[in-house]
């Protein structure tokens, strides 16, 4: 018969054979021949393989430094790597999660739009006509105005995005 | 069949480097890892270091690293090494062995002896 | 590095004997080990992979057992060619590490 050119999937070719890879959590230790099967052994303690593989080498597990503010969110495994998030009040600089700043808090002014999270910042937004927002927060919305009207008061000053409306009892009239 | 041809033996002066190859023949020599192995007169062997032929890459022992050089001509199936600044220690016999781990395939060795 | 650690430097034996040589490595290396024949001014050849696979065209009299940290090469019925120098080496994590050797010779 012909010799192959393409394997099975979770095979590779060498010296027009194929050959089984070594299955995720395994490394290849001695490649197949024409008498011989492929060997793989499994990955130590802190390393991983996530795909069928021929590599020699596992990929040590990802190191959450708590020194740049990292945690462990999800342990490796010998098929997985490492997950880490941020602590509490930080989050991540990009999408692999190497390093950590603190959450951005929205000024005076402006409102929380959406809460940051281990992995996205605060998300803030102006406060629009009839609401307001007087603290720097990470975490406060823009409050509506006080209604004067419904505690039977009138409005002494007028509010501003940064300052709710100042109510004060209505003037009598004197006869 | 698959076989492995190595140069003839070599007296190099001590400091100085030497070239030793190793010719593959009877297998796609892009396909399996090239060994070099080091027997000191009636001692043990040493394990060198690897080269994949296919890609390049090398792996080489510490207690080499400096000193061996790894390198393939993939134009002519054949993998070299080179040893500098040689000393008495390095007076053996160096074998090149194909395969990942175990070897099956073995040259039949290249005499190299320093002298002062 | 992992040690291998070969106690019998030397082992005499007479033609019809049942040979064990034995090897220790310093730490686990799993199965991942090979045995090696070599006769003076030769090349070594592979006897044994991953413990106890016998490579192609070796003699059924060799036989190689063991896992962890403790392996052995048996030559279940000692013939005179069969007298050599023997290595084993552990392959399970670099650097690859051989044992420094037992030489079988003739009581």
């Known amino acids: 018969p012909e010799p192959p050119t393409a394997c099975r999937e979770k095979q590779y070719l060498i010296n027009s054979q194929c050959c089984s890879l070594c299955q995720p959590g395994q490394k290849l230790v001695s490649d197949c021949t024409e008498f011989t099967e492929t060997e793989c052994l499994p990955c130590g303690e802190s390393e991983f393989l996530d795909t069928w593989n021929r590599e020699t080498h596992c990929h040590q597990h990802k190191y959450c430094d708590p020194n740049l503010g990292l945690r462990v969110q999800q342990k490796g495994t010998s098929e997985t790597d490492t997950i880490c998030t941020c602590e509490e009040g930080w989050h991540c600089t990009s999408e692999a999660c190497e390093s950590c700043v603190l959450h951005r808090s929205c000024s005076p002014g402006f409102g929380v739009k959406q809460i940051a999270t281990g992995v996205s910042d605060t998300i803030c937004e102006p406060c629009p006509v009839g609401f307001f927002s007087n603290v720097s927060s990470a975490f406060e919305k823009c409050h509506p105005w006080t209604s004067c009207e419904t505690k039977d008061l009138v409005v002494q000053q007028a509010g501003t995005n940064k300052t709710d409306v100042v109510c004060g009892p209505q003037d009598r009239l004197r006869a | 069949q698959v076989q492995l041809q190595q140069s003839g033996p070599e007296l190099v002066k001590s400091g100085a480097s030497v070239k030793i190859s190793c010719k593959a023949s009877?297998?796609?020599?892009?396909?399996?890892?090239i060994n070099w192995v080091k027997q000191r007169p009636g001692q043990g062997l040493e394990w060198i270091g690897w080269?994949?032929?296919?890609?390049?890459?090398?792996y080489c022992n510490e207690q080499f690293k400096g000193q061996a050089t790894l390198t393939v001509d993939r134009s002519s199936s054949t993998a070299y090494m080179l040893l500098s600044s040689l000393t008495s220690e390095d007076s053996a016999v160096y074998f090149c062995?194909?395969?990942?781990?175990?070897?099956?395939?073995w040259g039949q060795g290249t005499l190299v002896t320093v002298s002062a | 590095d992992i040690v291998m650690t070969q106690s019998q430097k030397f082992m005499s034996t007479t033609v019809g004997d049942r040979v064990s040589i034995t090897c220790k490595a310093s730490q686990s290396v799993v199965t991942a080990v090979a045995w090696y024949q070599q006769k003076p001014g030769q090349s070594p050849k592979l006897l044994i992979y991953s413990a106890s696979n016998r490579y192609t065209g070796v003699p059924d009299r060799f036989t190689g057992s063991g896992s962890g940290t403790d392996f052995a090469l048996t030559i279940r019925t000692m013939q005179s060619e069969d007298l050599a120098d023997y290595f084993c080496q552990q392959y399970s994590s670099y650097p690859y590490t051989f044992g420094g050797g037992t030489k079988l010779e003739i009581k």
């Open positions: 009877g297998y796609t020599f892009t396909d399996y890892y």
């Open positions: 080269i994949f032929p296919g890609s390049g890459s090398v």
């Open positions: 062995a194909s395969s990942l781990g175990k070897f099956a395939y």
